[in-house]
């Protein structure tokens, strides 16, 4: 399909789907006129959809097709019939050619469960399409995909729990009508970015839901509220799990993916932060040892401010292949933060910061910044990042994450930005200052922090090394260290990763 | 055993347009993309764009999007490239090439190489 | 487009020598490099993908390494028919793109 790149309107940040003549396939109606013919006049016509059994890591081994009815090739690639079962669906294609996630994938299945049958699920002809049709035609790959499932079943020890979707953009949709229209219900769908575009606001058997296997799980990447959202932003698993906010990806800015702008386009950042919901799963598979932990929270202001890092009653969870089964909750939307590139796991820790008083404040936000120092590393300097305002005499909450162990936390540095970032805020300094012209500068008094990590669930307080100084103003620091009655352990559930 | 076979060597006049095949044997036809490089005189090799037999599926380097049409023959297991408006810019060696699915697979079997000429 | 750069363009060597030629992409293609060979009459060859593995049929002098942005073939114990031009080729993002060739000669 020549010409098929999509035009992304970059400054009204919507993007125009254009792709070139559709193939010679038809609309929904007359293809699934085709795939139900009876089985003698089926033969004329070649399927819309294949399925390459991988035998084998190597991409370049052409694996087996499987076709409904046949059981030679079954036996001919040593289908395992007991064991798990894993059917990669691939989403809208602008190339006609899988795209290099699908490889990744393959080969981190083959390599975390040796014995398992890898499917992938050819559906480029219906794909490789306009977008609109493309989505059309999803119903019809989820009933040719059913179709399969159905006659695998009519084999002895095949079981439909043993049957895990992936599904990709588009493919995660397909996955949803598939477990829809399959006789019975299978052991679990991932939805890896589920499209969002047609998508979006649905009715629940018209996308992805939790109704659509006994395990439903989602990564949402890419998704906006404003502009057009590629990836759905709605939760529609039993878990839907938003790493950094489900939109905005580390290492997918234009600076990060182009390198240099002569390198590429907006186009690139779009599939950077798209994909990383596959690379996210992929790491899931490939580094069990650092697994990921994903925590409940209503929306992701309150994640941001640290308020959401409790394991208690399932709030907390591993993302990607080791999330534990919560067929109990439905739509559970989980947040947690990621470094830019595999292994993603950070290290979560919520801080308390109880302002008891403060002087002058004016109309500007302080910056703060904190270090911390454990037994393992000391971190970096790290951001605390204000999403409301600081309030005086309450408990302000915040969130910081680190790329690394720090072990058993020391102590921890606060400091106090003093040149203002933006000249903004030097305006509203400037217009302070001329309102209130003797004003003694700006001081906050902290006596102590809360830490807790989400990954241990531990809790600690540390006070001020000096029980006599607990002002800081711009432009200073102040040192807390872990106070004396520091070790303080709720009894709170540590997220165990419980592998599948 | 795996092999392409590409046509005879073309001398055309400039306006012209040309139609190249490429025969495969020794494999699926199907199960495999076939994608065509240009080779200037004396220069780099280009990537023009490739065909999924499977389904007709294509995708040019835009570059190329108005020059060459990708078109297969399942029952005979041939693919062809069509150049339309030949200029001398044209005047190249042009190869077909066994591909497998992902981006990433390399073109694993070559054909031998077509030479066009294009001369007033 | 990325830019794949085959600094040598030509390269002069001794039979049973060892040479490396190498190449440059201008982003990170994740180790998505392949390997050609062409000989003089025009037959090209595919040798190493995805930076280190050997094509079936193509001799153990041949290896491929590298990761990120730079990428090496080497060609160790150098014979009679290995005398031909050799182009790296990218394949992570389209449009594929191939480094300018490096030409090896008899010294």
């Known amino acids: 399909m020549s010409n098929s790149v999509p035009l992304l309107c970059f400054w009204s940040l919507c993007y125009c789907f254009a792709a070139g003549s559709p193939v010679p396939f038809g609309p929904e109606g007359r293809l699934e006129d085709k795939l139900h013919k009876p089985k003698a006049t089926q033969t004329e016509v070649k399927p819309s959809v294949r399925f390459n059994l991988r035998t084998s890591k190597d991409p370049e081994h052409e694996g087996c097709y499987l076709s409904v009815g046949h059981s030679q090739p079954l036996e001919d690639c040593s289908f395992n019939m007991t064991a798990k079962t894993f059917f990669i669906i691939h989403g809208w294609t602008m190339s006609g050619i899988f795209e290099n996630w699908l490889h990744k994938l393959v080969s981190a299945l083959h390599t975390r469960e040796k014995d398992a049958n890898v499917v992938v699920v050819d559906w480029l002809p219906l794909a490789h399409q306009l977008y609109t049709d493309a989505v059309n035609n999803t119903r019809v790959v989820g009933h040719s995909i059913a179709r399969m499932l159905d006659w695998l079943q009519e084999k002895d020890d095949f079981s439909l729990g043993n049957v895990h979707l992936i599904g990709y953009s588009l493919g995660a949709h397909v996955a949803g009508y598939a477990g829809n229209f399959v006789k019975g219900t299978v052991g679990r769908i991932t939805g890896l970015d589920p499209a969002g575009p047609m998508f979006e606001g649905a009715d629940i058997h018209k996308r992805l839901s939790p109704d659509d296997a006994d395990f439903v799980d989602v990564l949402h990447t890419y998704t906006r509220s404003f502009g057009l959202s590629i990836g759905i932003q709605m939760p529609v698993g039993h878990i839907d799990i938003y790493p950094n906010g489900g939109d905005f990806q580390p290492g997918c800015g234009l600076n990060d993916v182009l390198g240099s702008i002569a390198y590429g386009t907006i186009t690139e950042v779009v599939k950077c932060e798209h994909e990383r919901a596959v690379h996210l799963f992929v790491d899931s598979l490939v580094n069990q040892d650092k697994p990921s932990f994903a925590f409940q929270c209503t929306d992701s202001n309150r994640f941001k401010k640290g308020i959401c890092l409790s394991c208690r009653k399932n709030r907390c969870n591993s993302i990607g292949y080791n999330a534990k089964k919560m067929r109990n909750k439905r739509n559970s939307k989980m947040y947690l933060k990621t470094r830019a590139g595999m292994p993603f796991r950070v290290y979560h820790y919520q801080m308390k910061i109880h302002v008891f008083s403060y002087k002058n404040m004016g109309e500007i936000e302080p910056t703060f910044y904190v270090t911390l120092y454990g037994t393992n590393a000391d971190s970096q300097t790290l951001p605390l990042e204000i999403v409301e305002r600081i309030e005086q005499n309450a408990t302000n909450t915040f969130l910081v994450y680190t790329e690394e162990d720090l072990g058993d936390l020391l102590k921890i540095q606060l400091t106090w930005e003093g040149a203002s970032q933006s000249w903004y805020n030097l305006w509203k300094e400037f217009r302070s200052y001329l309102s209130q012209p003797r004003n003694p500068g700006r001081e906050l008094n902290i006596r102590r922090i809360r830490v807790k990590s989400g990954e241990t669930q531990r809790k600690l307080t540390f006070c001020t090394e000096d029980p006599e100084n607990t002002s800081i103003s711009p432009g200073r620091e102040l040192w807390f260290r872990k106070c004396r009655d520091g070790w303080r352990m709720k009894n709170e559930t540590s997220p165990t990763v419980e592998l599948p | 055993e795996v092999q392409l076979q590409q046509s005879g060597p073309e001398l055309l006049k400039p306006g012209a347009s040309v139609k190249i095949s490429c025969k495969a044997s020794g494999y699926t036809f199907t199960d495999n993309t076939i994608h065509w490089v240009k080779q200037s005189h004396g220069k780099s090799l280009e990537w023009i764009g490739h065909?999924?037999?499977?389904?007709?599926?294509?995708n040019n380097n835009e570059k190329f999007k108005d020059k060459a049409t990708l078109t297969v023959d399942k029952s005979s297991s041939t693919a062809y490239m069509e150049l339309r408006s030949l200029t001398s810019e044209d005047s190249a060696i042009y190869y077909c090439?066994?591909?497998?699915?992902?981006?990433?697979?390399?073109?694993?079997?070559w054909g031998q190489g077509t030479t066009l000429t294009v001369s007033s | 487009d990325i830019q794949m750069t085959q600094t040598t363009s030509s390269l002069s060597a001794s039979l049973g020598d060892r040479v490396t030629i190498s190449c440059r992409a201008s982003q990170d293609i994740n180790n998505y490099l392949n390997w050609y060979q062409q000989k003089p009459d025009g037959t090209v060859k595919l040798l190493i993908s995805y930076t280190s593995k050997l094509h079936s049929g193509v001799p153990s002098r041949f290896s491929g390494s590298g990761s990120g942005t730079d990428y090496s073939l080497t060609i160790s114990n150098l014979e009679r028919e290995d005398f031909a031009t050799y182009f790296c080729q990218q394949g992570n993002t389209l449009p594929f793109t191939f480094g300018s060739g490096t030409n090896l000669e008899i010294k």
């Open positions: 065909i999924n037999p499977y389904y007709g599926g294509t």
């Open positions: 090439a066994r591909k497998g699915i992902y981006y990433s697979s390399p073109f694993d079997y």
